[in-house]
Interface confidence: low
């Protein structure tokens, strides 16, 4: 039988009754064309929604949109379209709503051909009042809050200037022209790059990066010959070209641009690409294509300043600058990373590493499946996941892998069991330690979400066929119920609950057809009486994680700490609640040579922890380029893994001397960076 | 019931050697780290050694290092101490405990090493 | 490495008394400590685990708490078999998982 399906699955007392009287549908009055949602602030329940339809004419294409509010979590709406004037929104800015919980919203509007400038619609009390304003500038991409202070604002125009506000969007002041790219750094400043010649595309290689800290009052040069840049945790990038070819290389600054170092990084060519994976204040995933139309590169990690870079992965699978990679961060487990490798045979394997990129291996074959027909051995294989690459060739995959901070341990992804990614209808599985094991959780694709901090997980099974059936599970997926949320089936198009995993309300959306229309539809399901009581200490249980050898006093030691939650028994069917904190004790390890990565010109040999010198630099001193000046390393080969912990143990030296030489790699060195006020 | 039953203590001369064993019964002992802590006439507990649950791991405050050697034997269901150049300072009562990680959950009765001349 | 204060040193109090015994830590050791109970002549007995769980066996009198740097074991009524000596431990991070100096409970 399938899993959950066995006679030994506890039921959940009624729960057809207390689900149907927990159950809110709502018919919005429209033609079926496009819906887009979304959450306004943190456990506010507010959410708007916004329909678009397009009516075909002859000459032009009418549009009509309509919004609709609810403030209990999707359960009723409202039809506030009045309130923005019953004016036609952009669906491709889509709603630009502020951060933490502004109750900021921004909405772009529709214009006729021969306008002045764009028009947009604010709210800063949650959606239930509008504000309509007229722009000097016809707006190219979305308003973007600063993050740090939700009533500046920047947008580029459709004729590449630069337009910023500092009181949420009332007054603009185009503060640069020629602008191709812009975006916020920390503490209110603006990065944006300009072109000089012709235009972003014909200039791309000669770029200037430029920086304001007082939105647009003054100006600094901070890089030139700029083909793109990127901002990721701590760090500031940028890909410039080098000065005798088509080459170009990253440079890193970790002061906002005052000053650059050239990271360790192997050049690309003119059909290459950089891509940063995933940064945080520690370190950096870094992505660097390989030559040729291979849909392949390397990931390197970074040291703490982003300078020195250690391969990590060979064959990682990423097809096209923009393209797609199946690169997940797994948030329910510190250090765990899922992706895919391109193997020799041109199959797809899927790796996962539990110690931020130190390692890589396979995912252990499910105990409860059989290798599929990809495996040569039919008692040795493993998991394979579907992620976006699958996603993108239109695979039977409705969804990505999903994890939660919040819901410590799940995983919940699609896969399939054998040597590499299969073409076959794939399953949905399920590991509850972050990776380490998986269990299959459904048969066939389904779409699924967490709530209530993985208390309860939804699905809904993917099917072409009208569906009236919604399945949850009490115990993190090893048993399954099933209720008809409506008589009517309805043709679904996707699930949506609060971001975070804190709700207990799910809303099933999709549309209803009969002969003559189609209308959208949405049932919000809530799950609270499902779950009646609040949880209390004796429902929680210690669990160690990344525990693998429990005889050992290391166990569980990853970067440096290991970390004991307080996680939910399976069998206790109970609330988190949205006020609910993940309970973890860290305590310190020893230091071991995992804690160490091999330092610039050295290289770990397969399944061996030491480091040991690439044979192209043995006797070469190695010197690097910091700061614009030429460093050079006494290393034993390893530094410290950044943001790892441990104390004691094992200590190897490392040491850097400054040989007061200078190498600019044509890249501006400090003092010659010029400073403009407006 | 869990037992720990520590033996080998006496008097040794200053700069002399002793070896402490502790029989573990009632529980499975290759999964448990283990501890030695002791205690000197009159005196507070101090931690002394401890061994991981496969014998991989040993630890060590820094003024025991080096003269101080924990180790078991797993098929023996026992822990041992091997002290060397013994001092005045290291009279007290040995106790060997059970360390699942977070405390010292079962201790044994002790057994008593003096040094002196 | 992590220093241990106890308070007090020794302490004086009847039979259905509540003591409050503490313990300072040098630095955050996020709960990993543990309490100890020693009568003379014989070897310590755990009490309380990880900060605030009781061990096996042990009255539900003795109760832990504390996070951070400042751990308290309480007796909320005190017994004529509880006149002894207590201790606390560290065990956080890496060795030396130190003891407190001990706090002598005696009958007033």
């Known amino acids: 039988s399938a899993p959950g399906e066995d006679e030994e699955c506890g039921r959940v007392r009624d729960f057809v009754a207390k689900l149907a009287n927990n159950t809110h549908q709502h018919v919005f009055d429209d033609l079926r064309g496009s819906v887009s949602l979304s959450w306004v602030g943190d456990s506010t329940g507010v959410i708007l929604v916004l329909t678009t339809f397009h009516v075909p004419l002859v000459i032009m294409t009418f549009g009509q949109s309509k919004l609709y509010r609810s403030e209990d979590y999707g359960k009723n709406f409202k039809d506030i379209t009045d309130l923005i004037n019953n004016t036609f929104i952009r669906t491709e800015f889509g709603m630009a709503i502020g951060p933490e919980n502004s109750g900021k919203v921004v909405l772009t509007a529709e214009v006729s051909g021969g306008s002045r400038g764009g028009r947009i619609f604010r709210s800063s009390d949650f959606a239930k009042n509008f504000v309509q304003t007229d722009l000097p500038f016809h707006p190219l991409t979305q308003m973007m809050y600063s993050p740090q202070n939700s009533d500046y604002l920047l947008a580029l125009s459709t004729e590449n200037g630069l337009w910023v506000s500092k009181n949420f969007g009332g007054k603009w002041e185009e503060i640069h022209k020629a602008v191709c790219l812009a975006k916020w750094g920390s503490d209110n400043t603006i990065f944006f790059t300009t072109y000089a010649n012709g235009s972003c595309k014909a200039d791309l290689g000669a770029l200037e990066l430029w920086r304001t800290s007082d939105l647009g009052k003054s100006f600094k040069t901070i890089g030139v010959k700029i083909y793109s840049f990127g901002l990721g945790g701590r760090f500031l990038f940028a890909s410039v070209m080098a000065d005798k070819d088509t080459t170009r290389r990253i440079h890193v600054s970790t002061d906002q641009g005052d000053t650059w170092s050239m990271a360790q990084l192997p050049s690309v060519g003119q059909e290459q690409f950089y891509s940063i994976l995933a940064a945080n204040d520690d370190m950096v995933f870094m992505h660097v294509d390989e030559p040729g139309d291979t849909g392949f590169g390397t990931i390197f990690t970074s040291d703490d300043r982003g300078i020195v870079y250690s391969k990590s992965l060979d064959r990682h699978l990423y097809t096209t600058t923009g393209g797609e990679t199946d690169f997940t961060n797994v948030t329910s487990l510190r250090g765990v990373y899922i992706t895919s490798v391109l193997s020799e045979d041109n199959s797809i394997q899927t790796m996962i590493t539990f110690d931020q990129g130190g390692r890589w291996t396979h995912l252990r074959k499910p105990e409860n499946s059989e290798c599929d027909a990809t495996a040569k051995n039919k008692n040795e294989c493993s998991l394979h996941i579907h992620a976006s690459y699958s996603i993108s060739q239109k695979l039977n995959v409705p969804m990505a892998p999903l994890s939660e901070p919040n819901a410590v341990g799940i995983v919940i992804a699609h896969g399939s069991v054998g040597d590499a990614i299969s073409v076959m209808v794939p399953d949905v599985y399920i590991s509850d330690d972050g990776g380490y094991s998986w269990t299959k959780m459904l048969e066939g694709p389904h779409y699924y979400t967490i709530l209530d901090s993985g208390g309860i997980i939804v699905a809904i099974e993917h099917s072409s066929r009208p569906i009236n059936v919604i399945k949850f599970s009490t115990d993190e997926g090893q048993c399954w119920q099933t209720y008809t949320f409506t008589r009517d089936p309805i043709y679904f198009t996707g699930l949506a609950s609060e971001p975070g995993a804190r709700s207990m309300n799910i809303s099933i959306w999709g549309f209803t057809e009969s002969f003559l229309t189609s209308q959208w539809v949405s049932y919000t399901i809530d799950f609270k009486d499902i779950l009646e009581r609040n949880c209390e200490e004796k429902d929680y249980t210690i669990w160690l994680a990344h525990s693998t050898d429990p005889e050992d006093y290391e166990d569980g030691c990853i970067l440096g700490y290991k970390e004991q939650f307080l996680r939910l028994r399976k069998s206790s069917v109970c609330q988190n609640g949205r006020d609910y904190v993940v309970t973890k004790q860290p305590s310190i390890c020893l230091c071991s040579l995992e804690d160490f990565l091999c330092d610039f010109g050295y290289y770990r040999p397969e399944n061996d922890s030491k480091c040991v010198e690439q044979p192209e630099l043995k006797g070469h001193d190695l010197e690097f380029c910091l700061y614009g000046r030429e460093e050079h390393l006494t290393t034993n080969g390893y530094r410290k893994i950044p943001g790892d912990k441990c104390q004691g143990g094992v200590n190897p030296v490392r040491e850097v001397k400054d040989l007061k030489k200078k190498c600019t790699s044509n890249f501006l060195s400090p003092e010659k960076q010029n400073s403009k006020s407006n | 019931e869990v037992q720990l039953v520590e033996s080998g203590g006496g008097l040794v001369q200053p700069g002399g050697s002793l070896r402490l064993s502790c029989a573990a019964s009632g529980f499975t002992f290759n999964i448990y780290g283990m501890s030695w802590v002791r205690q000197a006439p009159g005196k507070g507990l101090e931690w002394v050694a401890t061994?991981?649950?496969?014998?991989?791991?040993?630890y060590y405050p820094d003024i025991l290092k080096g003269r101080f050697t924990i180790s078991r034997d797993n098929a023996k269901n026992s822990l041992y101490l091997q002290m060397n150049s013994g001092r005045a300072e290291d009279t007290a009562v040995y106790y060997c405990a059970r360390h699942p990680g977070g405390a010292m959950d079962y201790w044994g009765q002790g057994t008593l090493v003096t040094v002196s001349s | 490495d992590i220093q241990m204060t106890q308070s007090p040193s020794s302490l004086s109090a009847s039979v259905g008394d509540r003591v409050t015994i503490t313990c300072r830590v040098s630095e955050n050791i996020y709960s990993n400590l543990a309490w100890y109970q020693q009568k003379p002549g014989k070897s310590p007995k755990l009490l309380v685990y990880?900060?605030?769980n009781g061990a096996d066996g042990v009255p539900s009198r003795f109760s832990g708490s504390g996070s951070g740097t400042d751990y308290t074991l309480t007796i909320s009524s005190l017994q004529p078999e509880d006149f002894a000596t207590y201790y606390c431990?560290?065990?956080?991070?890496?060795?030396?998982?130190?003891f407190g100096q001990g706090t002598k409970l005696e009958i007033k």
């Open positions: 990880a900060a605030t």
């Open positions: 061994i991981s649950s496969g014998g991989i791991y040993t």
């Open positions: 431990q560290h065990f956080w991070g890496t060795p030396p998982w130190t």
